[in-house]
């Protein structure tokens, strides 16, 4: 089975991704997220499906989930706004906006990430960065420190082959290669960053990780610019 982190990745440079968030349920990491404004974190809608009775919070400024770090802050969630068209049984519209209880204190380790507003596909082969605290092997080991991996964008036609995702990848989704290097369980909701700009959010549908015939699926944020702007307004 693939070894390493995320899957096939490595430990991230500490505090070099100041937009990175850990969406937590009852004090434990649940999903990734990305700070898109001082008081808003973007994640995946499916992350909160089983969180009905739990306390959802957002951890910012972290590298290690367990160690004390001066930049770490745990924020309560004032409002959770899933995309109105997201549904439990599909990967479509898998976006969630979380309004923090207060504006985040910005600094070297906590800063919003610019997100793509131009609704155009990222060129196939473009190397993009995905980071998270998701499982690092098929045995389900969870890392304490943030992991990341660089993945090439895969064209939609290939991703939609019958042997791959068989037509499920709409224009509002994008794919990245998954040959031993991949995002996995616990990375859902995290950012796919291309050229320093947020292009995608890791979808949270159940999917085998690290299999090249099952590429990683990411929600294209540019396709949802109007919705994001309307919620943040």
């Amino acid at each position: 089975p693939p070894r390493g982190r995320i899957l096939g990745g490595r430990e991230a440079e500490a505090h070099a991704r100041p937009y990175m968030a850990s969406v937590q349920l009852n004090g434990a990491h649940l999903c990734g997220g990305v700070l898109v404004a001082e008081q808003w974190v973007l994640s995946a809608a499916h992350c909160l499906e089983d969180a009905a009775d739990g306390k959802v919070q957002v951890l910012l400024g972290a590298h290690s989930l367990s160690q004390p770090e001066p930049s770490k802050r745990l924020y309560d969630v004032l409002r959770a706004v899933p995309h109105p068209d997201s549904q439990p049984d599909t990967i479509d519209h898998d976006l969630l906006l979380l309004q923090l209880s207060e504006k985040a204190t910005l600094g070297p380790a906590v800063r919003p990430l610019p997100w793509q507003r131009v609704d155009r596909d990222v060129a196939p082969g473009t190397l993009c960065d995905v980071a998270g605290w998701g499982i690092v092997n098929h045995a389900g080991r969870r890392p304490d420190s943030l992991q990341h991996v660089l993945l090439p964008v895969l064209d939609r036609a290939t991703c939609n082959r019958r042997t791959h995702h068989d037509g499920a990848i709409t224009e509002r989704l994008m794919c990245a290669e998954s040959n031993r290097r991949d995002s996995c369980k616990g990375d859902s909701g995290g950012p796919l960053v291309c050229g320093g700009v947020l292009e995608g959010v890791v979808t949270s549908g159940s999917r085998v990780c690290g299999n090249r015939k099952k590429p990683g699926i990411y929600t294209r944020v540019a396709s949802y610019a109007a919705w994001i702007d309307s919620v943040l307004a």
Partner: antibody, heavy 117, light 107 residues
């Protein structure tokens, strides 16, 4: 022994530019966040720039944002501070400093920058 | 921005005596404060980090305490080499703000 040696300071006219260097030795430079701090003639200490260990993120307080640029060359164990549009208020001793436990644990001896016509 | 108010700005004490310097933050800094000794022509020397943790090689004559917004730093059994300027540093949120400094002289 941890050693940080700054260089590149001097007298510069207002509006001019200067590039400071900090040569590091005695530790694995690429493992550490680094910063530049300056001491004004009034002896006040002011943090002016920050860079993560691999150079993936930088940060500047508003006082110098857009005016100073921090960078590093881990292959050469060297930290840099490019300063432009210099003003008299930038006159100071400039120190490079290493971060550990997130505080600034080792500092160089400083290099003096004077902005005057 | 969080401000750090350090006092006194200068003080004079006798050899063998004890001095205390305080720093007050404009809001809670979660114990993320460090203390430095600075002598002319040299870089500041870290004495204490995270309120009270002594750096290796720093004698136990130096100590720190505090929480929330209020912090203090003490030197007991003063020695001639303690003549210097002392600064507090707040590093909560990885945002670095220094106190104004305290110049220590020996009577």
């Amino acid at each position: 022994e941890v050693k940080l040696v700054e260089s590149g300071g001097g007298l510069v006219q207002p509006g001019g530019s200067l590039k400071l260097s900090c040569a590091a030795s005695g530790f694995t430079f690429s493992n550490y966040i680094m910063s530049w701090v300056r001491q004004t003639p009034e002896k006040r200490l002011e943090w002016v720039a920050y860079i993560t260990n691999g150079g993936g993120a930088t940060y500047y307080p508003d006082t110098v944002k857009g005016q100073f640029t921090i960078s590093r060359d881990n292959a050469k164990n060297t930290l840099y501070l490019q300063m432009s549009s210099l003003k008299s208020e930038d006159t100071a001793i400039y120190y490079c400093a290493r971060h550990d436990f997130y505080a600034l644990d080792f500092w160089g001896q400083g290099t003096s920058v004077t902005v005057s016509s | 921005d969080i401000q750090m108010t350090q006092s006194p700005s200068s003080l004079s004490a006798s050899l063998g005596g004890k001095v205390t310097i305080t720093c007050k933050a404009s809001q809670d800094i979660n114990k993320y404060i460090a203390w430095y000794q600075h002598k002319p022509g040299k870089g500041p020397r870290l004495l204490i980090h995270y309120t009270s943790t002594l750096q290796p090689g720093i004698p136990s004559r130096f100590s720190g305490s505090g929480s929330g917004r209020d912090y203090s730093f003490s030197i007991s059994n003063l020695e001639p080499e303690d003549i210097a300027t002392y600064y507090c540093l707040k590093y909560d949120n990885l945002l670095y703000t220094f106190g104004g400094g305290t110049k220590l002289e020996i009577k």
